[in-house]
């Protein structure tokens, strides 16, 4: 349905608070370097304009598209050229090219200082002094660091952030109340950002067919009692929501997400028995709850798929008549029966089934040709099962830190050209799969592990795309979305890599090591480990373990010394010399 004024329509649908929050997020995700005050000024101007359009939809400029209105506003920023360089050239373009241009300049790794958490009393004072500004600052800081963060979900995080301060700033022990909540929000926020980044990459790099396939598989696992037509409707709506958010259309995205939540709650009976507790909640919480809802129980008596997808003489006829619908139904039927499989595995199985039909439906005896298609799935299923088993055993044996180190070594040997900070970040996150998934029952391990790894590897792909250095990474990232993880798993030591020259500066440490948090110390040590492997890619596990044990001992010794800096200056070169000898 068309509206005379799109901006008035969205303002009325969303309400002023959500409208302002979403516009702030949109602007912060586009202009990531702009100061907070500049963005607040722009948002206030847009909001005032929207109100004039609500009062009179025929007022001047109220008929313009949101892209035109927002783009015009962004292009009024005086320092655009000096702050953003060639991004300023976007402003010379017309819509829709201008918005596409802004999207292309979103930076997944902006050069912004890490967020430092002030003292609890300082934060509580700021919260009480000006709650609205405090919460806007949160939206701004998160959005500029995570330019693809799912905007309506960020509003939910902001609501939880507000609730945490409202509760804890009145508590007897403010810090004990607040800090765990902030840690939880930070960790959940990073995870949410990474998951959404994969959705956007899926849509932008592989198209909406890839995203729809992912959604069919995931929603069929969640809602195994729902009919295929119902799942298809949800997939269509969900694809629209995420296409809008990934495309920077945050007001439309939030509005459509609210409509989807409304539809799901009005049609619970034909979707899932698990939606009930979500549907009593307020909007932001409701949408979040629906997105995270647990899998419904499988219908009591599902038949084997063999009858319709192997034994039937009509397989090729049905496939030819509507390929995507037939494959979609196959994926739905398989996924609803297999909540124990990762979505990526289900998509590989559907791909294998499609490839078999493409080959066999052109053969002399199609039925004979595809009769064993399900048996061909076995190696595809066993590969992630074995991978999860082996890595969980390794995690249980080593613990998280050493498991991360094993992955650091493994991935540095595979792709040594990748920058050290990226290898450290990605390997540390890959290593978190252990604590996240290995404690789960067998039936939940694979979906947890492989779908989490897909999210982490997408981060590697996104960072690598910005600064490509490895053909292997490019190949794994671009050839097939569903085979990314198996592609990286299959990479071996890069024999063509010329080892990095030894640089003593890289292994020079100072007394500031001693004041670092445990996490920061780990990152320092892991950075050194990556540099060691880049210097000696063929070093054995035992050699590397020896050097790392010596490193830990050297740091511990100097941090206990009276004159720490003198100790580092004296013991450091000895450690470097001993390490070089050990790796020779």
């Amino acid at each position: 349905d068309t509206h005379k004024s799109e901006v008035a329509h969205r303002f009325k649908d969303l309400g002023e608070e959500h409208f302002k929050g979403l516009v702030l997020v949109a602007f912060s995700q586009y202009l990531q370097q702009c100061p907070f005050e500049e963005h607040v000024k722009l948002v206030n101007e847009v909001t005032e304009f929207a109100k004039t359009c609500v009062a009179d939809e025929s007022a001047e400029n109220c008929d313009k598209s949101l892209h035109t209105l927002f783009g015009d506003k962004l292009c009024t920023v005086a320092t655009l050229r000096e702050t953003y360089g060639e991004m300023a050239d976007c402003c010379a373009k017309q819509e829709p090219e201008r918005n596409e241009c802004f999207l292309q300049h979103k930076d997944d790794n902006p050069n912004l200082p890490p967020l430092v958490r002030p003292e609890v009393d300082v934060m509580c004072t700021a919260f009480h002094d000006n709650e609205a500004t405090f919460l806007k600052k949160y939206l701004y800081e998160v959005a500029r660091r995570h330019p693809y963060f799912y905007a309506p979900e960020l509003l939910f995080f902001a609501a939880r952030y507000k609730a945490a301060f409202a509760e804890c700033c009145q508590a007897a022990d403010k810090a004990a109340c607040l800090l765990p909540k902030l840690d939880e929000l930070r960790d959940e926020g990073k995870a949410s950002s990474a998951k959404q980044r994969l959705k956007c990459a899926s849509l932008q790099k592989f198209g909406d067919r890839a995203f729809k396939a992912w959604a069919v598989a995931r929603l069929s696992q969640k809602f195994p009692k729902a009919e295929f037509a119902e799942v298809s409707k949800l997939v269509t709506d969900l694809t629209k929501v995420h296409t809008e958010c990934c495309h920077g259309d945050l007001l439309e995205c939030a509005d459509d997400r609210a409509d989807l939540a409304k539809y799901m709650c009005e049609n619970q009976d034909s979707i899932s028995s698990k939606l009930k507790e979500c549907c009593d909640k307020p909007l932001l919480e409701k949408s979040h709850c629906l997105a995270e809802v647990e899998n419904d129980e499988m219908p009591a008596d599902l038949p084997s798929l063999a009858a319709d997808y192997v034994e039937s003489k009509d397989v090729c006829k049905n496939y030819a008549e509507a390929k995507d619908v037939f494959l979609g139904m196959f994926l739905y039927e398989y996924a609803r029966r297999h909540p124990d499989y990762s979505v990526m595995l289900l998509l590989r199985l559907a791909k294998a089934y499609e490839a078999t039909l493409e080959k066999c439906c052109a053969a002399a005896d199609p039925h004979e040709c595809y009769a064993k298609v399900f048996d061909e799935f076995q190696p595809l299923v066993e590969e992630p099962q074995n991978l999860v088993k082996q890595n969980c055993e390794l995690f249980e044996q080593l613990g998280e830190y050493k498991f991360q180190n094993a992955l650091l070594v493994r991935y540095t040997k595979k792709v040594p050209q990748v920058s050290t900070p990226t290898l450290v970040e990605v390997s540390r996150n890959l290593g978190k799969v252990g604590a996240k998934c290995c404690k789960l029952p067998e039936a939940k391990r694979m979906p947890c592990a492989e779908d989490y790894l897909s999210v982490v590897l997408n981060r590697l792909c996104v960072l690598h795309e910005k600064t490509p250095v490895s053909e292997k990474v490019t190949k794994c990232c671009t050839e097939s979305l569903v085979n990314r993880r198996p592609c990286f798993s299959a990479l071996e030591l890069d024999e063509a890599y010329v080892p990095k020259a030894f640089n003593a500066e890289t292994f020079t440490f100072h007394a500031d090591m001693c004041t670092l948090s445990e996490k920061e110390k780990q990152v320092k040590k892991q950075t050194a480990l990556v540099e060691l492997v880049k210097h000696k890619p063929k070093a054995t596990k035992e050699q590397l373990k020896g050097v790392m044990d010596n490193f830990a001992a050297f740091v511990e010794k100097c941090c206990k010394a009276d004159d720490k800096e003198a100790c580092f200056a004296e013991e450091g070169p000895k450690f470097v010399a001993a390490s070089q000898a050990a790796l020779a």
Epitope: D301, L302, L305, R337, D340, Y341, F377, Q378, A443
Partner: nanobody
């Protein structure tokens, strides 16, 4: 601990009948699809027949259709395989298996396996 115990195997003349039983313990029987697989000497294990959790759906390999019948009794935690018109090529060790999640009835979808019972069909 999950246990599947097969019984009812033995030596039978071609054209004769046997009824195999598989008693399950240590699992929620009604939550598992059940299947019978067989392995003849020197050959790979093959699926013979499987039955859905509630018993409403069955899958039969072409080689046994019309001769074998699978059934289950969820109250007794037991699955049965009635084998009629037996042939020498039916000679094999018959394994009972349970699948928490199943789409295809293929071997890799089955989580628990019995030790097997030998069926010998003489000509």
């Amino acid at each position: 601990e999950v246990q599947l115990v097969e019984s009812g195997g033995g030596l039978v003349q071609a054209g004769g009948s046997l009824r195999l039983s598989c008693a399950a313990s240590g699992l929620t029987f009604s939550s598992y699809a059940m299947g019978w697989f067989r392995q003849a000497p020197g050959k790979e294990r093959e699926r013979v027949v499987s039955i859905s959790r509630g018993g409403g759906y069955t899958y039969y390999a072409d080689s046994v259709k019309g001769r074998f019948t699978i059934s289950r009794d969820n109250a007794e935690n037991t699955v049965y395989l009635q084998m009629n018109s037996l042939k020498p090529e039916d000679t094999a060790v018959y394994y009972c298996a349970a699948a928490r999640y199943w789409a295809t009835g293929s071997e890799y979808e089955f989580d628990y396996w019995g030790q097997g019972t030998l069926v010998t069909v003489s000509s």
